[in-house]
């Protein structure tokens, strides 16, 4: 066979679909690899060919488009399953070609099983809701293109195993689920089941997402440095270990990069010659506010080190703050034999 531009196995597109449900899978060539769309390719006389390799097999085989009730079909650049079966799992390839041109890409398709509470190995999208922020909605995802706009599906919403009927603060409204005031107790997995008719058959689409209630932007503040502070003095003798924690609280902010760093005499620790180590730990509250702690450590501190300026800095989308640690050299307790004796005029 003549040469074909092979984009390999596109593992970035790990497609997961539920067993016994319809699935429509677009050929990734037009979305990620080529600079033209299917219509342009088709107009130019290019043909889209599909084939697959079953799970745990090496043999590429054509897809059987002659199954009863057209269970698998192709429409433009979409491969349709009506519905999927567990053994449809495998690597699927779409190839665009004519006599002079060829390009192909493979992608993995995994058909997964769900339990009665919609648990499955499927990776779930996470939707963040702001706590006590007013009405917020989640929308049943990835159902476009399954049925025409003339078809009115029925949509049922569940939290875990249980159907959501109008409840104090969670209200199903067709494709949307409205949270009047989101609370921590609303955290969990929410599932919409979309049921629609097609050619005398009834199909179900199941879509689950995780709702995570997070801190509201109304309550967000610039970073707060809890340590170092004015109440703690790091008093050390030369040769001792100096440990200074920088503990910073960050309000949850969507897509904000939280940063903490130390400067020593105005320079980053990497840019100076002292043997200093920095260890960082991060913890989160239930609403994803973040506390970062960076511990600056100098194993054997020198009297020079104890004269330096140690400043903790923090930055988020809400602002930047800094706080200097109070570091000083401990005055050694007098040794009687020398200092006190001298004080008493002994020679």
């Amino acid at each position: 066979s003549e040469r074909c531009d092979d984009w390999g196995l596109d593992t970035m597109r790990q497609i997961q679909v539920f067993e016994d449900e319809p699935a429509r899978i677009k050929c990734p060539l037009f979305e990620h690899f080529l600079k033209f769309n299917y219509s342009t390719a088709h107009s130019a006389g290019l043909t889209l060919i599909w084939y697959w390799t079953r799970q745990d097999r090496d043999l590429e085989e054509p897809i059987n488009f002659r199954l009863p009730e057209n269970r698998i079909s192709k429409e433009k650049d979409v491969l349709w399953f009506r519905p999927t079966l567990l053994n449809d799992t495998g690597n699927y390839t779409c190839m665009l070609r004519n006599t002079t041109y060829c390009s192909k890409v493979a992608f993995p398709l995994e058909v997964v099983q769900k339990d009665s509470c919609f648990n499955s190995p499927m990776k779930l999208p996470v939707h963040k809701l702001y706590i006590e922020y007013g009405i917020q909605r989640i929308t049943c995802p990835n159902v476009d293109g399954y049925f025409p706009s003339s078809v009115k599906p029925t949509i049922t919403w569940y939290m875990g195993c249980y159907k959501i009927q109008n409840f104090n603060n969670v209200i199903p409204e067709g494709m949307n689920l409205s949270f009047l005031i989101a609370l921590i107790s609303n955290n969990g997995n929410y599932t919409c089941v979309v049921t629609y008719p097609e050619n005398g058959r009834t199909f179900h689409l199941t879509r689950t997402l995780t709702v995570k209630v997070v801190g509201s932007p109304k309550n967000a503040v610039p970073p707060v440095i809890h340590s170092p502070n004015d109440h703690v003095v790091y008093e050390k003798e030369p040769g001792e270990e100096l440990l200074i924690p920088c503990t910073v609280y960050f309000s949850f902010l969507m897509d904000s990069r939280n940063e903490v760093w130390w400067t020593i005499d105005g320079k980053k620790p990497d840019d100076i010659t002292i043997d200093v180590t920095i260890n960082e730990s991060i913890s989160h509250s239930r609403t994803e506010d973040e506390t970062r702690t960076q511990i600056l450590s100098i194993k054997k501190v020198t009297s020079e080190d104890l004269k330096r300026s140690y400043v903790c800095h923090a930055r988020s989308a809400k602002g930047e703050v800094a706080k200097a640690a109070k570091v000083k050299q401990k005055v050694p307790a007098p040794r009687y034999t020398v200092e006190l004796a001298c004080g008493f005029g002994a020679t």
């Epitope: 339990d115 009665s116 509470c117 939290m159 875990g160 159907k163």
Partner: antibody
Amino acid sequence: QVQLVQSGAEVKKPGSSVKVSCKASGGTFSSYAISWVRQAPGQGLEWMGGISAIFGTANYAQKFQGRVTITADESTSTAYMELSSLRSEDTAVYYCARHLHNAIHLDYWGQGTLVTVSS
Amino acid sequence: EIVLTQSPATLSLSPGERATLSCRASQSVSNFLAWYQQKPGQAPRLLIYGASNRATGIPARFSGSGSGTDFTLTISSLEPEDFAVYYCQQGKHWPWTFGQGTKVEIK
């Protein structure tokens, strides 16, 4: 620690109803669901249905549909199971058990309530 | 509804021996299966969920395996307190169903 405490034993006449309660403590009631499972003398376990503590919606086994009603009172952290039109074969120990809203396994169980149906 | 068949009905073993209990489903339940232990006069206790995950506080001698229709609960070395009835339960489809139980008794 989590505890589910059920109401005491009941003796009922055929055709009557029984309502068993299950009070939860040591956890956030609204974060969980409560299922009811029964066990006839010397027999295995039979799942009857369950309820979401937060939404108050229930799932029932087809076998009990129309005869069992499961409710939950979030204010008292208590779930109830009412079984009507009792017959002698309903004589069993009735257990309540807790599970996460999206879990199919029952992680904490009540001590059980013996319901005897006899004329 | 899905029928779970446990075997054997009774298993007679001595302390220290290995116990292997089987649970077969009438159709695939993937890995949506749990195991429980029940002692006389007590409520069941969750041992294993998701076919192979040990519940909190369950000793390492208990292990679960299997997927689809065939599942196994193994007790690597029986302790005196392990003699009880064991039930499997599926949650793949409504209604949730239990096996009829396997009694592990002292030989």
